[in-house]
């Protein structure tokens, strides 16, 4: 039985798209179940009902899971340091990237170290 | 780029068990769903089950529940597909694939196995 | 599980016509629905993911659409090349199944 679909068409009359890109599946309630996924298509937008399975969200937690590397040294400059992760496993359905990189704020104790490295580079 | 690799083609005699190999080489073999697939002479195509070689995970179609065992070798990035007691029916070409929801799957060569007395 | 029915069973067409192929969903399966092209004697080919998602390598000439309970894969100029069965699979939930193939064939 079709479900019935939300259609909020933005685009002018007859308008056609060649290719639709579709977000996650987010339940209504709780972490599973039913719920909507939204789409976009060049000016139009669709919102459709979808259903994560609540078996997936069990076996799987996080849609994309990485391995990460150790934290890279902290960067004087910006106050942040830099690891990379590549992809462990993904949820079946997940359109994971491969590697990504992610950073955070020095603690102030390793800035300081930056920055007193930083100036002994430049006596 | 993942290429997969099957082994040859194998004849069995009605429960003899066969194990199908699947060597993967390029990208990383470990972060992708591993499935496996059939497709008897003349048929369309059946999904048996998959596994994830990160963690052994493995999601079998019901129906092979006590036909088919799927494993891996990690360390020789190479799956495997074990059929027990295999009976004439189970007569089909079985095939691998890796799957990545981003980029799509790559499949195996695929390897007739025959079963006959 | 999940019944995927394939229409027409058999495609007969000329070089240069447009092919539509239909696949119909037993439930709604959002877009998590795949397009394979099998020639004889090779594994499937992949042509479109998720419905209407292009797939590298694959000519611009194939599209789907979808998603919900209705899709349709459009060959919008038929190269002989494209002389094949074309197969649906939905992966939405398990197990995961295949429809039950088209062929397209030379008129």
């Known amino acids: 039985v079709a479900k019935k679909k939300d259609k909020v068409k933005k685009g002018g009359p007859g308008s056609e798209c060649a290719e639709w890109a579709w977000g996650p599946c987010t339940p209504s309630s709780k972490d599973c179940g039913v719920g909507f996924r939204e789409g976009t298509c060049g000016a139009q937008t669709q919102r459709i009902r979808c259903r994560v399975p609540c078996n997936w969200k069990k076996e799987f937690g996080a849609d994309c899971k990485y391995k990460f590397e150790n934290w890279g040294a902290c960067d004087g400059g910006t106050g942040t340091k830099v690891r990379q992760g590549t992809l462990k496993k993904a949820r079946y359905n997940a359109q994971c990237q491969e590697t990504i990189r992610v950073t955070k704020p020095c603690t102030p104790k390793t800035k300081a170290k930056a920055k007193a490295k930083k100036g002994k580079g430049k006596d | 780029q993942v290429q997969l690799v099957q082994s040859g083609a194998e004849v069995k005699k009605p429960g003899h068990s066969v194990k199908v190999s699947c060597k993967a080489s390029g990208q990383s073999f470990s972060s992708y769903w591993m499935n496996w697939v059939r497709q008897a002479p003349g048929q369309g195509l059946e999904w048996i089950g998959m596994?994830?070689?990160?963690?052994?995970?493995?999601i079998l179609n019901q129906k092979f529940k006590d036909k088919a065992t799927l494993t891996v070798d990690i360390s020789t990035s190479t799956a495997y597909m074990e059929l027990s007691s295999p009976r004439s029916e189970d007569t089909a070409v079985y095939y691998c694939?890796?799957?990545?929801?981003?980029?799509?799957?790559?499949w195996g060569q695929g390897t007739l196995v025959t079963v006959s007395s | 599980e999940i019944v995927l029915t394939q229409s027409p069973a058999t495609l007969s067409l000329s070089p240069g016509e447009r092919a539509n192929l239909s696949c119909r969903a037993s439930?709604?399966?959002?877009?998590?629905l795949h397009w394979y092209q099998q020639k004889p004697h090779q594994a499937p080919r992949l042509l479109i993911k998720?419905?209407?998602q292009s797939i590298s390598g694959i000519p611009a000439r194939f599209s789907g659409s979808g998603p919900g309970t209705d899709f349709n894969l459009t060959i919008s100029s038929v190269e002989p090349e494209d002389f094949a069965v074309y197969y649906c699979q939905q992966s939405n939930s398990w197990p995961l199944t295949f429809g039950g193939g088209t062929k397209l064939e030379i008129k």
């Open positions: 694939s890796s799957w990545s929801a981003k980029r799509g799957d790559f």
């Open positions: 998720y419905a209407s």
């Open positions: 439930e709604s399966i959002s877009n998590n």
């Open positions: 596994i994830h070689p990160s963690d052994s995970e493995t």
